[in-house]
């Protein structure tokens, strides 16, 4: 077969080919930020000629054109400046209201490099209607000027702009407009990952965190899909595998879906996951009817087995058939469970469609969506039982209208998105399921996104101050208790001057709490073995502080999971009859277990906890410490089995002021405290300029660095004695 010519450069931009120069290959242009390619893509035809999708005239030279944002068509009850036909990237538009009207939304908006305005639609409202004035987004025209109960407004976009959101909205009895705000956008515009992740997350995060079965959630964040304790979520992942998706992009689709699956199983809900790949025909890799759909490892392995070559004989995009296979799955499940049963009616359904183009065969996908809505009996009362997310990737041949038609329309939410590329998709799935904003005490959740602050990443981390100076660190283990080291308290029992500094979203300095009571392990006595030539002994180096008030849970303050508790068991997704021993076997399951602690400056540092034989060789080094232990005969006199050991190879060593802080691991996107920093043979902060400077020990140092952490699995009786009514402990 002939290949297509190679004279396809774009001035100022670059291009990629999905299958080289061979027929069927899709050439995709890209431009620097703030510019967009025209045309966006070309397809190599079997005749050996390039064809531009949707183009009527002959091949024109590809160019990068400047992105522009749409201008307001009309702005009611106010004025806007400057008045331009469209606005360049970085350009501003300002809004002011006439007397008697109050401005809602953003008074100034800026055109962003993706052709989208920042901020929110500006509306001049006098509060007269049953519903608030729904406004007119930039580039839109609205018909309908009455905002009473039952009144409707309709929207369309000017010139060649594309409408996303609801073209028609109705003022409902609760004073809220139905559907979602319409936005008019340039056909070439796309969404930034940092906008999509929270928008997607709003719909998802509470759905996942709300079923924390150990306590009822008091507050819900926006509209989140509520899954009651008995509830169940069916998640359907639909992955486009058509010809225009390159093999590499398909891998990223798979990886993103895996991320999603991994995250979703880390929450305390009952979930079944279906995996469907599609091109001309759909292929069901995992059905919700299969028991394995509830098992994360099975779902992930079926995803990993998804093969790009599965669809090489039919390379069209049949979105209808993919959605129809979801419908058929639902139909079968309804038959199995019984249409009238609670078991069927209480299942929530979320469909995520990942595609790179418009459907080009099999009929309108909207028909399949209508069937799905019908079988699930989606009406105003049952609107929360279905969410369809339509995510277009690649912004080249993606059809905004179609995506918008497929995505759910819910007030204050968006369900249709177009991302620039698969990398952006990966970023979104990495950050969308962030339950760190939940207000209940769900444990071990840290914000893992790249732009999160240190405190948001480790929201359990607290600082302990005897007076003005910081002394030790600790970890929130509930909304009122902090776990720390006993050796921090060497001034007797007067803790009236002590303060605990807890993260607070309103202040970068955190919030100070007084201590109601300090429970210091009675077994701790640093001088206990002085007569044996052990000048400092740190056995039982553990303490609990009860704060004078409860901490309000937030992105910056949240407890870490303590192993051997029901809370940790849920986070680990372990079966109900699990024991403390099971947790130890799962968390400390290797000779060298990667773990972390938090540095003085708040950053997360890495260590490796040595277990088994490696623990012995890790601890042996203590015999070389002649100052503290001048005539030590048995290392185990100093390093008892209460201690975890780290500090070998590339490990960071904690500083003295990091004592009491959590030693923690990450499992299934949740964090578990297995130890607390106690003592060590090397202090990397000693005499440093500030909290940001640490010195690595020279390789020749004798003894080499070693660090010892109280092992919480060895402190169970004491923890249970004092926290029995705070946490739900599992049998030993």
């Amino acid at each position: 077969a002939p290949s297509c010519p190679q004279n396809v450069n774009i001035s100022g931009g670059t291009f990629t080919l999905s299958h080289g120069w061979a027929p069927g290959s899709l050439l995709t242009y890209s431009c620097p930020q703030g510019l967009y390619p025209s045309p966006a893509s070309r397809l190599c035809k079997s005749s050996g000629q390039w064809q531009t999708p949707g183009a009527t005239r002959s091949l024109s030279k590809a160019v990068c054109k400047p992105v522009r944002c749409p201008a307001p068509v009309s702005f009611e009850n106010g004025i806007y400046t400057p008045r331009l036909g469209s606005y360049p990237v970085g350009g501003n538009v300002s809004f002011e209201c006439e007397d008697g009207f109050i401005l809602r939304g953003s008074p100034v908006r800026q055109c962003r490099p993706n052709g989208m305005w920042d901020g929110e639609t500006a509306v001049c409202d006098n509060g007269a209607g049953h519903c608030p004035n729904p406004g007119i987004s930039l580039g839109a025209v609205r018909t309908g000027f009455r905002f009473g109960h039952g009144d409707k407004v309709r929207y369309r976009c000017s010139s060649n702009l594309v409408l996303t959101g609801s073209s028609e909205r109705e003022c409902q009895g609760n004073g809220v407009w139905s559907g979602t705000e319409p936005i008019c956008r340039q056909p070439y515009s796309y969404d930034f990952p940092e906008d999509v992740a929270p928008a997607l997350g709003t719909s998802f995060s509470h759905m996942l965190g709300a079923t924390n079965p150990t306590q009822k959630t008091k507050e819900s964040l926006g509209r989140k899909i509520q899954i009651q304790r008995s509830g169940h979520l069916n998640l359907y992942l639909l992955l486009d595998c058509s010809q225009s998706v390159s093999e590499n992009d398909f891998l990223i689709f798979k990886e993103s879906a895996s991320l999603m699956v991994d995250r979703i199983f880390s929450f305390e809900i009952n979930v079944s996951v279906a995996i469907i790949t599609f091109a001309s025909e759909p292929k069901v890799l995992m059905s919700v009817l299969n028991d394995n759909s509830r098992d994360m490892t099975e779902v992930i392995s079926s995803l990993e087995n998804a093969n790009y070559k599965d669809h090489e004989n039919g390379t069209g995009t049949n979105t209808y058939a993919a959605l129809n296979s979801v419908y058929l799955m639902m139909n079968n499940q309804m038959r199995l469970l019984g249409m009238e049963t609670m078991a069927w009616q209480e299942i929530r359904h979320a469909i995520i469609l990942l595609t790179d183009g418009k459907s080009n065969m099999g009929g309108s996908p909207k028909t399949a969506v209508d069937h799905i809505r019908e079988i699930l009996n989606i009406n105003q009362k049952r609107n929360d039982y279905l969410d369809i997310y339509a995510i277009g990737v690649g912004k080249l041949d993606v059809d905004w209208r179609e995506l918008n038609e497929l995505g759910s329309k819910k007030d204050g939410e968006r369900h249709a998105f177009i991302l620039q590329d698969t990398k952006a998709l990966h970023q979104v799935f990495e950050h969308m399921l962030d339950v760190s904003k939940l207000t209940d005490t769900i444990c071990g959740v840290g914000n893992m996104s790249a732009n999160a602050s240190d405190q948001e990443r480790t929201p359990w981390h607290v600082t302990i101050k005897p007076k003005s100076q910081e002394t030790c660190r600790g970890a929130l283990i509930s909304d009122q208790w902090v776990l720390t080291a006993a050796h921090c308290f060497r001034d007797g029992n007067d803790h009236s001057l002590w303060r605990v500094n807890v993260g607070d979203p309103k202040s970068q300095w955190g919030k100070e709490f007084l201590i109601e009571k300090a429970v210091i392990s009675p077994g701790f006595d640093v001088f206990a073995k002085k007569n044996q030539g052990i000048l400092e002994f740190y056995g039982d180096d553990i303490a609990l502080l009860k704060l004078a008030q409860k901490v309000k849970m937030s992105t910056h303050a949240r407890p870490i999971c303590l192993p051997c508790t029901m809370e940790a068991n849920l986070a680990l997704r372990r079966p109900q009859g699990s024991t403390c021993r099971d947790h130890e076997n799962e968390l400390l399951n290797k000779q060298s277990v990667p773990a972390h602690f938090v540095a003085l400056n708040g950053s997360k540092l890495n260590i490796n906890l040595k277990m088994g034989v490696e623990w012995t060789s890790c601890a042996e080094v203590v015999s070389q410490e002649k100052t503290m232990f001048p005539n030590l005969t048995d290392v185990r006199e100093v390093v008892t089995d209460q201690f975890l050991c780290s500090g070998t190879q590339e490990d960071e060593s904690p500083c003295k002021g990091e004592s009491g802080g959590a030693v923690f691991l990450e499992r299934r996107f949740r964090f578990f405290q297995v130890g607390l920093v106690s003592w060590g043979l090397y202090n990397p902060c000693l005499g440093s300029a500030d909290k940001n400077s640490r010195k690595r020990a020279p390789r020749s140092k004798v003894p080499p660095p070693r660090d010892f952490h109280i092992n919480l699995f060895r402190m169970q009786p004491w923890l249970r004695q004092h926290l029995g009514d705070v946490l739900n402990f599992l049998p030993l």
Epitope: C472, G657, L686
Partner: nanobody, 122 residues
């Protein structure tokens, strides 16, 4: 906070010895890590030695290891620095410092003495 007063500085020949003392007022001396720092003319203040609140562990800067010894007497609320084999480069003002955490971060220390000058002539 602990009030600190250094003494014992002076002029000494290279190879000679000096013993610096630091007396602390305040009943909490025994619960503080104590340390010595020094500052040579035109240079940054640098860490010399520290001792834990228990007296059980000590740390030294590489430049003084084997020559200087830090010790404390909690019953007298006093910290000592025994300096042997002194060199011209040991010339500096020596400061005593108290730190509850034991890290002796220069940015965080709020208990310093006024310093005592040690001059080593060659």
């Amino acid at each position: 906070q602990v009030q600190l007063v250094e003494s014992g500085g002076g002029l000494v020949q290279a190879g000679g010895s000096l013993r610096l003392s630091c007396s602390a007022s305040g009943h909490t001396f025994r619960s503080y890590y104590m340390g010595w720092f020094r500052q040579a003319p035109g240079k940054e203040r640098e860490f010399v030695a520290s001792i834990s609140w228990t007296g059980g562990s000590t740390e030294y800067a590489d430049s003084v290891k084997g020559r200087f010894t830090i010790s404390r007497d909690n019953s007298k609320n006093t910290l000592y620095l025994q300096m042997n084999s002194l060199r011209a480069e040991d010339t500096a003002v020596y400061y005593c410092a108290a730190d509850y955490s034991g890290d002796f971060l220069l940015s965080d220390l709020d208990s310093w003495g006024q310093g005592t000058l040690v001059t080593v002539s060659s």
